[in-house]
Interface confidence: medium
């Protein structure tokens, strides 16, 4: 697994840097994150012939991923700080579940599985503290997401193989999308 | 090969409005960073619009905002430039361009040619 | 808005000088910075990106270093076909920025 935010060589050569703001720690993390996914994707991608398929097979699939929308008010047009950042913790409070279900879905990047879904935690923690308004944060019911596990790990070999795709599309296309908006606050 | 190529240039009027297109192959725009920059003659360069492709989303410099408008076709594997209300100061070279982002990697990798917009009476 | 301050606006050298080219940024970018090469009439081409690190088929004279608000750009050794005009782009957020330039002319 790669080595968290704030311990890459380069920090560690060059210990008189000036400490990472609020801002730069987040947009450092996801990024972290982001690296975690594309090594999940390879692996997804070597395995199976899911990278290639079409949108259109895609989006026929069931699943209830969080996605950006105009009224998220992460875009630049009616774009608001406090509703965006709402969306994006709510967002990464529901992917939580689909992170769970890729625990078990990789033989040589296990670790970078698990990797991924701590550093998300830590991300909603650093995400929390800048929010006002935790009160509009919505978290997701656990026996929901309990029934939602059972059913996802239920599915055959091939379906399972394109939630993995899916999931993991999905959550670096958010976490990118999050990204931009962070960077307007 | 990946490359774009662009039209929709020429002289017009102040008030007017233009068109911009920028084709693109060997790369699918659809998961692509789009954007627009443009050059004044003699002088630097100057971000314009972008466009994310995972949502559709637009972002604006302040001097177009609400007069520009950049969109795609994704079937035509195209992206537009629509400029209204144009001004003197709009004057200048048009760079369609494509933005590598792939989190850890963020810059510039692909430019058209160019198209010149001149806005004069 | 970031601003990018390029610093010299021209730059005169001679073929074989070691030139460096300079810009801040009004507020900490992280290694989101870019060089660009422009030559009249020309796109701009991409030299350097996140910083320091060189494009695919840029020769090895050029080099980028820096991280935060002070950025450089180095060529160590001009050619001939060096002579042009040089930008720093801060890829951070939107608004997305360009140095004002530095024309690199023959002495």
């Known amino acids: 697994a790669p080595v968290p935010p704030g311990e890459d060589s380069k920090d560690v050569a060059a210990p008189h840097r000036q400490p990472l703001t609020s801002s730069e720690r987040i947009d450092k993390q996801i990024r972290y994150i982001l690296d975690g996914i594309s090594a999940l994707r390879k692996e997804t991608c070597n395995k199976s012939n899911m990278c290639e398929s079409s949108k259109e097979a895609l989006a026929e699939n069931n699943l209830n991923l969080p996605k950006m929308a105009e009224k998220d008010g992460c875009f630049q047009s009616g774009f608001n700080e406090e509703t965006c950042l709402v969306k994006i913790i709510t967002g990464l409070l529901e992917f939580e579940v689909y992170l769970e279900y890729l625990q078990n879905r990789f033989e040589s990047s296990e670790e970078q599985a698990r990797a991924v879904q701590m550093s998300t935690k830590v991300l909603i923690q650093f995400l929390q503290k800048k929010a006002k308004n935790l009160d509009a944060i919505t978290t997701p019911d656990p026996t929901t997401n309990a029934s939602l596990l059972t059913k996802l790990q239920a599915q055959n070999q091939w379906l399972q193989d394109m939630t993995t795709h899916l999931i993991l599309r999905s959550f670096k296309e958010f976490l990118q999308s999050s990204l931009r908006a962070l960077r307007q606050m | 090969e990946v490359q774009l190529v662009q039209s929709g240039g020429g002289l017009i009027q102040p008030g007017g409005s233009l068109r911009l297109s920028c084709a693109a192959s060997g790369f699918t725009i659809s998961s692509n960073y789009m954007i627009w920059v443009r050059q004044a003659p003699g002088k630097g360069l100057e971000w314009v619009s972008d466009l994310y492709y995972y949502a559709g989303d637009t972002y604006y410099a302040d001097s177009v905002k609400g007069r520009f408008t950049m969109s795609r076709d994704i079937s035509k594997n195209t992206v537009y430039l629509q400029m209204n209300s144009l001004r003197a100061e709009d004057t200048g070279v048009y760079y369609c361009?494509?933005?590598?982002?792939?989190?850890?990697?963020?810059?510039?990798?692909?430019w058209g040619r160019g198209t010149l917009v001149t806005v004069s009476s | 808005d970031i601003v990018m301050t390029q610093s010299p606006s021209t730059l005169s050298a001679s073929v074989g000088d070691r030139v460096t080219i300079t810009c801040r940024a009004s507020q900490g970018i992280s290694s989101w910075l870019a060089w660009y090469q422009q030559k009249p009439g020309r796109a701009p081409k991409v030299l350097i990106y996140k910083a320091s690190t060189l494009e695919s088929g840029v020769p090895s004279r050029f080099s980028g270093s820096g991280s935060g608000t002070d950025f450089t750009l180095t060529i160590s050794s001009l050619q001939p076909e060096d002579f042009a005009t040089y930008y720093c782009a801060a890829h951070y957020a939107a608004p997305w920025t360009f140095g004002q330039g530095t024309k690199l002319e023959i002495k």
């Open positions: 361009a494509r933005w590598a982002d792939d989190h850890n990697n963020t810059y510039i990798d692909v």
